[in-house]
């Protein structure tokens, strides 16, 4: 039960985190005009990864996309790449984790397979969260570096002109969304990895040893009482296609990397 809860919670936390990473990536407010100790402009400038915007005093807002790829700073490109990689990994992780959820039964998928998928999705979430945190942190560092520069824009030459008005930029809302979202995705991934350990086929303490037909080598797991045949054949005269409704001792246990954790 605790494993299912941990896995489910990990999935939900990661889902929220990835939604946040997507939101942060799409947001325009990665950097916002610093209003403190600055010339008071009648327009408010803010910039995202994909476009820059201006809000006029009337509230009218106009945005312009960065219609150049080569003209953009390498750091901005790197941040874009990190965020996209984070989203892609997170999306794949979500897809994998849906099938790995213990509460969802798909065909005759075994616990070991679900454990593998849970671990895979957990690792994906961790990497996704790290990508987002790294991307946001790189951008934040870029802002701090440029904050004291005398040029008007953080991206000199991006607009084709350098303003003489010293517009300084500070952290925008997207940075905080990105940090929180990346953190949530990371936490969700860790929870999935923890859940994976509990999902690995556990050694069940049977009151009696299962006896199999002679002629088969019987392998006993160290420290456990669960027996399994060396060949994985169906030793009882039962239909194999029983729709997945097998008794516990009918399920064949195969060694996996989780068995000796």
């Amino acid at each position: 039960m605790a494993v299912t809860a941990c896995q489910g919670l990990g999935f939900v936390v990661s889902l929220i985190g990835i939604a946040g990473i997507i939101a942060a990536t799409c947001m325009d407010q990665w950097s916002t005009q610093d209003l403190y100790n600055n010339p008071v402009t009648a327009v408010f400038n803010y910039q995202g990864l994909w476009r820059s915007c201006v809000r006029e005093s009337s509230g009218f807002t106009e945005c312009r996309g960065y219609f150049t790829l080569l003209g953009l700073p390498a750091m901005l490109q790197a941040v874009r790449a990190l965020m996209i990689v984070g989203i892609v990994l997170g999306a794949i992780g979500l897809l994998v984790s849906i099938f790995a959820l213990k509460c969802i039964r798909i065909g005759s998928m075994e616990d070991s397979a679900k454990a593998n998928m849970t671990l895979t999705s957990g690792i994906m979430f961790i990497v996704s969260g790290l990508c987002a945190i790294a991307g946001v942190s790189v951008f934040a560092n870029m802002l701090v570096t440029n904050f004291w520069m005398s040029t008007a824009n953080m991206y000199t030459g991006m607009g084709g002109m350098v303003q003489t008005v010293q517009t300084r930029y500070t952290f925008g809302a997207a940075l905080f969304v990105g940090w929180v979202a990346g953190g949530l995705t990371l936490i969700g991934g860790v929870m999935m990895c923890i859940a994976c350990r509990g999902l690995a086929p556990e050694e069940t303490n049977y009151k009696a040893v299962s006896y199999h037909a002679s002629g088969h080598s019987v392998a006993y797991k160290p420290g456990g009482f669960k027996a399994s045949t060396g060949f994985g054949s169906n030793t009882k005269n039962k239909k194999i296609y029983d729709g997945g409704a097998r008794t516990e001792d009918e399920v064949q246990s195969y060694p996996s990397k989780h068995d000796y954790v």
Partner: antibody, heavy 119, light 113 residues
Amino acid sequence: EVQLVESGGGLVQPGGSLRLSCAVSGFTFSSFGMHWVRQAPGKGLEWVAYISSGTTNIYYADSVKGRFTVSRDNAKNSLYLQMNSLRAEDTAVYYCVRSGYYGNSLDYWGQGTLVTVSS
Amino acid sequence: DIVMTQSPDSLAVSLGERVTMNCKSSQSLFSSGNQRNYLTWYQQKPGQPPKLLIYWASTRESGVPDRFSGSGSGTDFTLTISSVQAEDVAVYYCQNVYIYPLTFGQGTKLEIK
């Protein structure tokens, strides 16, 4: 039709005070920022003050800072300019102006009210 | 404060003639965020309040005849009247609407010969 009607101008002694009013009609007053602009007789235009639609942002020209106060009453569709410590150089026609939706332009102007500061 | 300087102070032209007047700002009025220049042109006829002609340095206000056009970027701007009419006699002002205080130029007076 957009209409801006200024009132409250007149003759005042140096050091005196005056309160200008601007009655607005023909548009949703609470949605627009408003400016005061003045023009000394035979001279050019001088921007005086700005107040945003929700009074969050208020800006003044250096020449009037600390002496003039701009305010608005959205319920009464009215804009005000409280002028204290008046000087001879404040003598001008004062225009109430609406801040346009695009380009921070000053799109609708009142007819103006004359303020004369003289002893 | 941004200083706006207009030239010439006055000019006299014949009807139908093309006229240009200039406005120079002490700082750039260009906003890279939306690639716009925050400069506005006004026309003030004798005894009347000013009237908005052009905003964003080159966008005509609705109802303004197309003989009026604005151009320029950064610190240098121009107002052009392609074919001067009698009703164009006025003083033309440019204004910085980018940084407070929103300063005006001293004006260019247009007269007919």
